[in-house]
């Protein structure tokens, strides 16, 4: 079948990086600048993606593969193939419509992206708080209060968890 297909369709012989040029008796022509074909037998080459504005070139376009973009420093990718760039915030913050805002008490974010999440409620697992949480770090849970030696006291547990994604305005 492949052999008969290539006999009937000369375009199938055109490798990646070329296109089957109908204007030139179906000769395989190289993709023009700023275009590519990633598979053989194509009748046109695709236009290379341009990494413009806040998008930064991660991989340059070649005759056989499209350019790949990431985001300029200070931004991070969102969506398939980095379709959008969203600004980074600092650890201990989350991005709101009004910009980067500090995590409110009882929540933390240890990344430059995403939302503030509630501290772990150690008592739900029958444990005590070994290390207090901060805006940037979750609490560290330790042994249950019953496991502590007599006279030892645990740190006061954190405030009850709340729905993530809110922040002081």
């Amino acid at each position: 079948f492949e052999r008969t297909r290539s006999l009937q369709d000369p375009c199938s012989n055109c490798p990646a990086g070329t296109f089957c040029d109908n204007n030139r008796n179906q000769i395989c022509s190289p993709c023009p600048p700023n275009s590519f074909s990633s598979a053989g037998g194509q009748r046109t080459c695709d236009i290379c993606r341009q990494c413009k504005g806040v998008f930064r070139t991660r991989k340059e376009c070649s005759s056989t593969s499209n350019a790949e973009c990431d985001c300029t420093p200070g931004f991070h990718c969102l969506g398939a193939g980095c379709s959008m760039c969203e600004q980074d915030c600092k650890q201990g913050q989350e991005l709101t419509k009004k910009g980067c805002k500090d995590c409110c008490f009882g929540t933390f974010n240890d990344q430059k992206r995403g939302i503030c999440r509630p501290w772990t409620n150690c008592s739900l697992d029958g444990k005590s708080v070994l290390v207090n949480g901060t805006k940037e770090r979750d609490v560290v849970c330790g042994p249950s209060p019953a496991d502590l030696s007599p006279g030892a006291s645990s740190v006061t547990p954190p405030a009850p968890a709340r729905e993530p994604g809110h922040s002081p305005q």
């Epitope: 413009k52 504005g53 600004q87």
Partner: antibody, heavy 117, light 107 residues
Framework: QVQLQESGAGLVKPGASVKLSCKAS????????IHWVKQRSGQGLEWIGW????????KYNEKFKDKATLTADKSSRTVYLELSRLTSEDSAVYFC??????????WGQGTTLTVSS | DIQMTQTTSSLSASLGDRVSISCRAS??????LNWYQQKPDGTVKLLIY???RLHSGVPSRFSGSGSGTDYSLTISNLEQEDIATYFC?????????FGGGTKLEIK
């Protein structure tokens, strides 16, 4: 064609504040970051910070975060740099530049600030 | 912060010469290296981005090369209008940083 035009500098007294303007034209204003860059006499270039009209995002070089404030007016396609508590160290040429990809593709002509009593 | 070092602060050459200006980063900047030209009147223009890509309208006598931490700008056939100061800049990591500049003069 892309054009950036700075204005607002001049002779200012120590301790005062000054607001510099960068008016952009020739492209879609909301698609590109605008940077401010400082150049002291006969010296190199220092990045102050950026304003991204697309999202209102602002980023400062830590060195300038207590000195500079960036704002913008989308309707007039202008980005502002306000410098506070001026000293002789702030005397410099201030450039705005457009950001594309990871470089500064178009620059204004610069505006000269002199801080002196 | 990434330090950008241009070891030669001034350079003297004759018209028609091939001139190279070097720039070193304090850490790998993954080819995110750009070159700017500042004319004596203060005007700044982008020449080369991403190590070796020529910005639109820049004459082909300008070229760039390098990788990792070491980069260079070459002017293959020096012309009078190339008299300027040349700055490198890294676009890999915030804050953006520039080299100290290399002033090019005619012998």
């Amino acid at each position: 064609q892309v054009q950036l035009q700075e204005s607002g500098a001049g002779l200012v007294k120590p301790g005062a504040s000054v607001k510099l303007s960068c008016k952009a034209s020739g492209y879609t204003f909301t698609e590109y970051i605008i940077h401010w860059v400082k150049q002291r006499s006969g010296q190199g270039l220092e990045w102050i910070g950026w304003f991204y009209p697309g999202s209102g995002s602002i980023k400062y070089n830590e060195k300038f975060k207590d000195k500079a404030t960036l704002t913008a007016d989308k309707s007039s396609r202008t980005v502002y740099l306000e410098l506070s508590r001026l000293t002789s160290e702030d005397s410099a040429v201030y450039f705005c530049a457009r950001h594309d990809n990871q470089y500064f593709d178009y620059w204004g002509q610069g505006t000269t600030l002199t801080v002196s009593s | 912060d990434i330090q950008m070092t241009q070891t030669t602060s001034s350079l003297s050459a004759s018209l028609g010469d091939r001139v190279s200006i070097s720039c070193r980063a304090s850490q790998d900047i993954s080819n995110y290296l750009n070159w700017y030209q500042q004319k004596p009147d203060g005007t700044v223009k982008l020449l080369i981005y991403y190590t070796s890509r020529l910005h639109s309208g820049v004459p082909s006598r300008f070229s760039g090369s390098g990788s990792g931490t070491d980069y260079s700008l070459t002017i293959s056939n020096l012309e009078q209008e190339d008299i300027a100061t040349y700055f490198c800049q890294q676009g890999n990591t915030l804050p953006w940083t520039f080299g100290g500049g290399t002033k090019l003069e005619i012998k």
